[in-house]
Interface confidence: low
């Protein structure tokens, strides 16, 4: 269990031409607020799906009146965060919806009524218990920027919120096969109490005895990926024991897509593809206009200014659809190389590379010990990428061609001379002096500061370094 | 349990009136751009007539342009459509939409004959 958290730091216009008019005026006065919906990471952005994950609104900000004449600046926000309680794990993957609404606080019949300003779409990666995330959306004219966390409740810790946590019992360590809580050093964290056998990366539970599965996993222990790949029809509710989806009737069966939209089945649902000027789950809403802010994710509205004419939405890179409500996964393409592990974030896309690659697609093989070789008895290392040798006794250089002076480096203190040695170098120490590198002085009354010469060396004999 | 319930249909000569009313509950009825659509025997549904979730945008199809004026009440969670002038192709189910970012409600539609 834990807390999503938004803070919204602005709202304001965005960058560029076209500033928005105000939404409010002096015969309208009205207040902002603000509506944050939560869905697992695998889930549809559509906005008609549930908000899977939970939903918060916000308190009402301060009355605003536009200055005549004057543009719209960022208007006056509500305080406090936005916090959405989750009571499962925490999924790691998450989809946002955020909306700004319009309180109209004018002469109205039946109190204040409200309208939709904006509304931003996303898609992130963040894991419970770390720092504030910032981020920046647009929506038409309008811009948002705003930071968002998952912190875990206590008992629970980590990424996922699903690791338990307990005062110590004994106050210097955790019993036995028990780790301290980080960040909470002085507990201790819970013996886990779930089903025998439960997945410990795809699986948790809240009471003992029970291993509820995260989303995408399935099965008694949550060992079983849901996967359609091995089965015979993509249909029907999902087999706790295999994965499979077993047939049944198809979710497009009676085309339950509107006004002449295509149904096409997902591992889900379906999915409907309107015809312009239609959009919803079921392509059911039409006569939309511009005004109406049809477009998803910051897409750009075109034409459309009466009912009768379609818009059209130019979507921002990542994002597709009538309305630009569909993330394109630009993963699906594969485009890193070598192995290389493909992460779409929202706004750019990185591969993280398999060790002796790099580059912006994983493109370029680092691994220059292939067919080079070390002279005089060096190995190649491979480390960070680059190629480098270890060099056997003596010797040195990128390839260890080079005869190493072991003297380059004055290792004798005490102006002590150096001689090169096929084992290594010899210091010949100065009178006063003794040591492998000169460095112990020898005391007047012959007394080294060793406590005693090794056996058949006087003080002032030069010393072999081996 | 979400609701929308058309009433105010019924058999009327051309060139008559009729006034047809749409009782919301269940939901946030104010936050929701309500729309009045309508289905001919034997066609596609067409959409009649919408109105912002304030009331101070309203749309109307060709169709229906000069005479029908859709409006609301959001104190009462009620929409209307006072509907002109009626000619014989107006006859059809008409049903009430409420739509929003996150979710479309229908109602079951009430039946408006116009004949002589």
């Known amino acids: 269990a834990g807390v999503f958290e938004l803070q919204i730091h602005s709202f304001g216009p965005g960058p560029g031409p076209g500033a928005p008019r105000s939404p409010c005026s002096a015969r309208l006065p009205c207040r902002l607020f603000f509506r944050v919906c939560l869905k697992p990471g695998l889930s549809e952005e559509a906005a008609e799906s549930p908000c899977a994950l939970g939903a918060a609104l916000s308190a009402r900000g301060p009355v605003y009146t536009e200055q005549p004449g004057a543009p719209a600046p960022d208007l006056p926000l509500p305080d406090g965060l936005l916090q959405v309680p989750f009571r499962d794990a925490w999924p790691g993957t998450f989809s946002f919806i955020i909306e700004t609404w319009r309180e109209e606080l004018g002469d109205q019949i039946g109190g204040p009524a409200w309208s939709l300003l904006a509304r931003v779409a996303g898609r992130r990666r963040l894991a419970a218990g770390g720092p504030w995330a910032r981020d920046i959306q647009r929506a038409g004219a309008w811009e948002l920027r705003f930071s968002y966390r998952a912190r875990c409740e206590p008992p629970a810790v980590g990424t996922a919120c699903t690791r338990l946590c307990r005062p110590r019992s004994a106050p210097s360590r955790c019993g036995p096969g028990l780790r301290p809580c980080a960040p909470l050093e002085d507990e201790c964290e819970a013996p886990l109490v779930c089903r025998a056998g439960c997945s410990p990366e795809h699986g948790f539970c809240e009471q003992p005895g029970e291993c509820r599965c995260l989303e995408g996993w399935t099965g008694p222990l949550c060992t079983v990926p849901v996967s359609t790949s091995s089965c015979l029809s993509p249909r029907g509710p999902s087999s706790a024991t295999t994965g499979c989806l077993v047939p049944g009737p198809g979710p497009c069966d009676g085309n339950p897509c509107a006004n002449g939209g295509s149904c096409s089945e997902t591992p889900r649902s379906f999915e409907c593809t309107c015809p312009r000027g239609f959009y919803g789950l079921r392509c059911e809403v039409s006569g939309v206009t511009c005004a109406d802010g049809p477009c998803f994710n910051g897409g750009l509205c075109v034409g459309g200014a009466d009912p009768d004419s379609a818009y059209i939405c130019h979507c921002p890179p990542g994002f597709q659809g009538s309305n630009c409500e569909k993330r394109v996964d630009r993963c699906s393409l594969q485009p890193c190389r070598n192995g290389g592990l493909c992460l779409d974030l929202g706004h750019a896309l990185r591969c993280r590379c398999r060790a002796g690659f790099a580059g912006p697609r994983c493109e370029h093989d680092l691994d220059d010990c292939a067919g080079r070789a070390c002279a005089n008895g060096g190995t190649c290392v491979e480390g960070g990428g680059a190629h480098r040798c270890s060099c056997a006794l003596g010797f040195g250089g990128r390839d260890c061609r080079e005869r190493a002076d072991p003297c380059a480096a004055r290792p004798c203190a005490h102006g002590g001379r150096c001689y090169a040695h096929f084992s290594g170098l010899v210091c010949a120490c100065a009178p006063g002096y003794m040591g492998a590198r000169c460095e112990f002085p020898v005391h007047p009354d012959g007394a080294s500061a060793l406590p005693a010469a090794p056996p058949g060396l006087r003080p002032g004999d030069p010393q072999r370094y081996l | 349990q979400v609701q929308l319930v058309e009433s105010g249909g019924g058999l009327v000569q051309p060139g008559g009136s009729l006034r047809l009313s749409c009782a919301a509950s269940g939901f946030d009825f104010s936050t929701y751009t309500v729309n009045w659509y309508r289905q001919a025997p034997g066609q596609e549904r067409e959409k009649v007539a919408r109105?912002?979730?304030?009331?101070?945008?309203?749309n109307y199809a060709n169709s229906a342009k000069g005479r029908f004026t859709i409006s609301r009440d959001n104190s009462k969670n009620t929409l209307y459509l006072q509907m002109n002038s009626l000619r014989a192709e107006d006859t059809a189910v008409y049903y009430c939409?409420?739509?929003?970012?996150?979710?479309?409600?229908w109602g079951q539609g009430t039946l408006v004959t116009v004949s002589s």
């Open positions: 939409a409420a739509e929003r970012f996150d979710s479309n409600y």
């Open positions: 109105i912002s979730s304030t009331g101070t945008t309203t």
